[in-house]
């Protein structure tokens, strides 16, 4: 079953996906698509990386993490109800049938009437200690740094535990890390 993530209309949605490159800069192609992962490739591709950089993107979809270190988590900006559905993160490991496939379910909720306080986060990369804010409503938050190696079963269990008490997208502070090589 898919791991569920939630966002409100007008916010940014965050769908986590990670792998560990075999060596620094030794990147693996990744595709993100709308719809469950098919046998090969991604259907309805919204973003794609190659061994060096992002080589295909669409306007509201971008990578907010350090993709060169294997953080290929997808940000969908300014979501609408139409963005609800299953998204596929496919890590295209060389070799026959070696790809890692992750199906993530995005649930978009109508915006709350009462605006929540804007959250913020610090960057530590090229913009040292950079503050990020959303112009309307809460910002997406993301923890950059080491991520625990946990399997999808653990994530699913954690999602079930959190679903009733916290937003499922709080899972962004954990992520499935695929080691390559």
């Amino acid at each position: 079953s898919e791991v569920e993530y939630r966002a409100e209309v007008g916010q940014n949605a965050y769908l986590p996906c990670f792998y560990t490159p075999a060596a620094p800069g030794n990147l693996v192609p990744v595709c993100w698509g709308k719809g469950a992962c098919p046998v090969f490739e991604c259907g309805n591709v919204v973003l794609r990386t190659d061994e060096r950089d992002v080589n295909y993107w669409t306007s509201r979809y971008w990578l907010n993490g350090d993709f060169r270190k294997g953080d290929v988590s997808l940000t969908i900006e300014n979501v609408t109800l139409a963005d609800s559905g299953i998204y596929c993160c496919r890590i295209q490991i060389p070799g026959i049938m070696n790809d890692e496939k992750f199906n993530l379910k995005l649930v978009i909720k109508p915006a709350k009437v009462t605006p929540a306080p804007t959250r913020q986060r610090d960057f530590t990369a090229a913009f040292p200690r950079m503050l990020t804010t959303r112009g309307h409503g809460p910002a997406e938050t993301q923890t950059l740094g080491s991520l625990p190696d946990i399997n999808l079963t653990q994530i699913s269990t954690l999602a079930n535990e959190l679903r009733d008490s916290r937003l499922a997208n709080d899972l962004r502070d954990s992520g499935a890390t695929i080691r390559i090589g």
């Epitope: 973003l47 993107w57 306007s59 971008w62 993709f67 950079m130 990020t132």
Partner: nanobody, 121 residues
Framework: QVQLQESGGGLVQPGGSLRLSCAVS????????MGWFRQAPGKEREGVSC????????SYPDSVKGRFTISRDNAKNTVYLQMNSLKPEDTGVYYC??????????????YGKGTQVTVSS
């Protein structure tokens, strides 16, 4: 051909303000994350602001937070940097930049040629 053309730089006294503009051509701005970088003499280029494709998400380092504001007008293919309460350490060449499909922390695809900002009394 992608072109980013900065304007609005100049000499200003400490405490003063400037508004930089970046005219974008050759790409669809609302599909790009845009940023402003600066480079002082003898120093590395550093990011001073970043804005997402729709303008809904912005970022600033502590050194300019509360003083600089980035904005964009996709209909006019223009990105702006409003700089208030300028300090001598803000002096440098300011570059407009664009990146496809990812946030600006991890490098940019395109840079303009820059506009000089000098803060001095």
């Amino acid at each position: 051909q992608v072109q980013l053309q900065e304007s609005g730089g100049g000499l200003v006294q400490p405490g003063g303000s400037l508004r930089l503009s970046c005219a974008v051509s050759g790409l669809t701005p609302d599909a790009y994350v845009m940023g402003w970088f600066r480079q002082a003499p003898g120093k590395e280029r550093e990011g001073v602001s970043c804005i997402s494709p729709s303008g809904g998400t912005t970022s600033y380092p502590d050194s300019v937070k509360g003083r600089f504001t980035i904005s964009r007008d996709n209909a006019k293919n223009t990105v702006y940097l409003q700089m208030n309460s300028l300090k001598p350490e803000d002096t440098g060449v300011y570059y407009c930049a664009a990146v496809a499909g990812r946030w600006c922390d991890y490098g940019m695809n395109y840079y303009g040629k820059g506009t000089q900002v000098t803060v001095s009394s």
